[in-house]
């Protein structure tokens, strides 16, 4: 008789999840000399230990502490790029501007990027059928708690000028319910961070509006100002040209507004 299995609303664990995590860890530690000391088998064991045999709606930040410890990494605190709802462009940017880092450019972010995972209470099985959805099922699920934990730590580490890339095509350019709005903004440390600089990325080629005047951007400034962190905002009217100019800053067309 097949054992009854909890049906969650979200997609199940990504296929070949253990192999993917292990392979990504090996690849990352090969490319990044400062992380060569990391034992990827131990990393996988710690990752697995955070959610296996645990109820997938009962995960805590504490569960991820062994993994956090193994994945401890120092990135230049003044070279941090946060993003919200515009991951691809943020990653394209840091691939060109190699001295800046998104969370997914760190080991732990790289391991988990675009993956889903969950286990089952009291069994050592990984659930490949379904996992809890943040909205429909529960917020304390393995994936959400992981990203909340690493995002908090990433924001806490930031200093000087912190940049954030925001999607100007969305109805809420700054969304307080996003990871940036609910976790990262509140964990920037005012004694270390002088300025948060927002880059609002425009979608349409003919869009010449000043999206820095958007009400949600003013809301972001309002939150940041109470924490005594300065705020600045720039429109990126042409993201394609923006990336091109990061690659080739000497290009004559790069002196005009992008």
């Amino acid at each position: 008789v097949p054992r009854w299995r909890q049906q969650w609303s979200g997609p199940g664990t990504t296929k070949r999840f253990p192999e993917t995590v292990l392979a990504r860890c090996v690849k990352y530690t090969e490319i990044h000399p400062e992380m060569r000391h990391v034992d990827c088998q131990s990393v996988w064991d710690a990752f697995k230990g955070a959610f296996i045999s645990k109820h997938p709606c009962n995960i805590t930040e504490e569960d991820y502490q062994p993994l956090m410890k193994l994945g401890t990494q120092t990135v230049p605190c003044n070279k941090i790029l946060l993003w919200s709802r515009i991951k691809d462009l943020a990653h394209q940017f840091t691939q060109v501007q190699r001295d800046m880092f998104t969370l997914e450019d760190t080991l732990l972010g790289y391991l988990a990027d675009d993956l889903t995972w969950c286990g089952e209470f009291n069994t050592s099985k990984i659930n490949y059928q379904s996992c809890p959805d943040w909205r429909k099922d529960c917020s304390n699920n393995p994936v959400s708690v992981f990203w909340k934990t690493v995002s908090r730590r990433f924001a806490e580490a930031a200093c000087d000028v912190v940049h954030v890339m925001l999607n100007g095509s969305r109805s809420k350019i700054f969304d307080k319910n996003s990871t940036f709005g609910s976790v990262e903004v509140h964990n920037l440390q005012p004694e270390k961070v002088q300025t948060l600089e927002a880059w609002v990325i425009h979608g349409g080629r003919e869009d010449s509006r000043d999206l820095c005047q958007d009400p949600t951007i003013k809301e972001l400034e309002s939150i940041i100002s109470k924490r005594n962190i300065q705020f600045s905002c720039k429109n990126i009217y042409r993201p394609d040209k923006f990336l091109q100019c990061v690659k080739n800053p000497e290009d004559s067309s790069c002196t005009s507004e992008i």
Partner: antibody, heavy 118, light 110 residues
């Protein structure tokens, strides 16, 4: 001239309801987070509630959570405070105040008095 | 019980310098915006010091403020009779997601 003008206060029995209004003029209301602060007779200032620029987010003091609702109508330049299930300890002068980034609660109204008594 | 702690009263003679203290914690005074408000008898509070130490326009330079760690203080030099009022410190509190006030200090000019 930047001005906030509260209205809607009065005498109400315990368990009753009141709706306070705050009319703004002289500044772009829709650019500011707005707040209600109260002061019980002979006591200090107590923050009650705030509402974000867009109105999407609201915050409340524990003492009023579940009983008071803050809202705003940017087209009418008006802030509201719906107060239900009022208690004697809600008796106070209620002020509205705007939050100006990097300044604080910048401009205050003259206040409206709410008395909850049987 | 107020989140921020102020002395309930302070006094001084005309021309004197008076200081009012305000004590809080990491989640409010240390890392966030601190303001001081003056409330003259029978009137609404008025912003006296913004952004920890700045005086809004129209506030005399006799009023100054400082902040160190989890404490803030307001200094009034050259005390005048019209300075007789209640003074409140306030700060944004991260952990409460709220504005928090001190209990207020009643300043008497003798």
């Amino acid at each position: 001239e930047v001005q906030l003008l509260e209205s809607g206060g009065g005498l109400v029995h315990p368990g009753g309801s009141l709706r306070l209004s705050c009319a703004a003029s002289g500044f772009t209301f829709s650019d500011y987070e707005m707040n209600w602060v109260r002061q019980a007779p002979g006591k200090g200032l107590e923050w009650v509630s705030s509402i974000s620029i867009t109105g999407d987010f609201t915050y409340y003091a524990d003492s009023v959570k579940g009983r008071f609702t803050i809202s705003r109508d940017n087209s009418k330049n008006t802030l509201y405070l719906q107060m239900n299930n009022l208690r004697a300890e809600d008796t106070a002068v209620y002020y509205c105040a705007n939050y100006k980034s990097y300044y604080g609660l910048d401009v205050w109204g003259q206040g409206t008095t709410v008395t909850v008594s049987s | 019980q107020s989140v921020l702690t102020q002395p309930p009263s302070a006094s001084g003679t005309p021309g004197q310098r008076v200081t009012i203290s305000c004590s809080g914690s990491n989640s409010n005074i240390r890392y966030n915006l601190v303001n001081w408000y003056q409330q003259l008898p029978g009137t609404a509070p008025k912003l006296l010091i913004s952004n920890n130490v700045q005086r809004p326009s129209g506030v005399p330079d006799r009023f100054s403020a400082s902040k160190s760690g989890t404490s803030a203080s307001l200094a009034i030099s050259g005390l005048q009779s019209e300075d007789e009022a209640d003074y409140y410190c306030a700060a944004w509190d991260d952990s409460l997601n709220a504005w928090v006030f001190g209990g207020g200090t009643k300043l008497t000019v003798l």
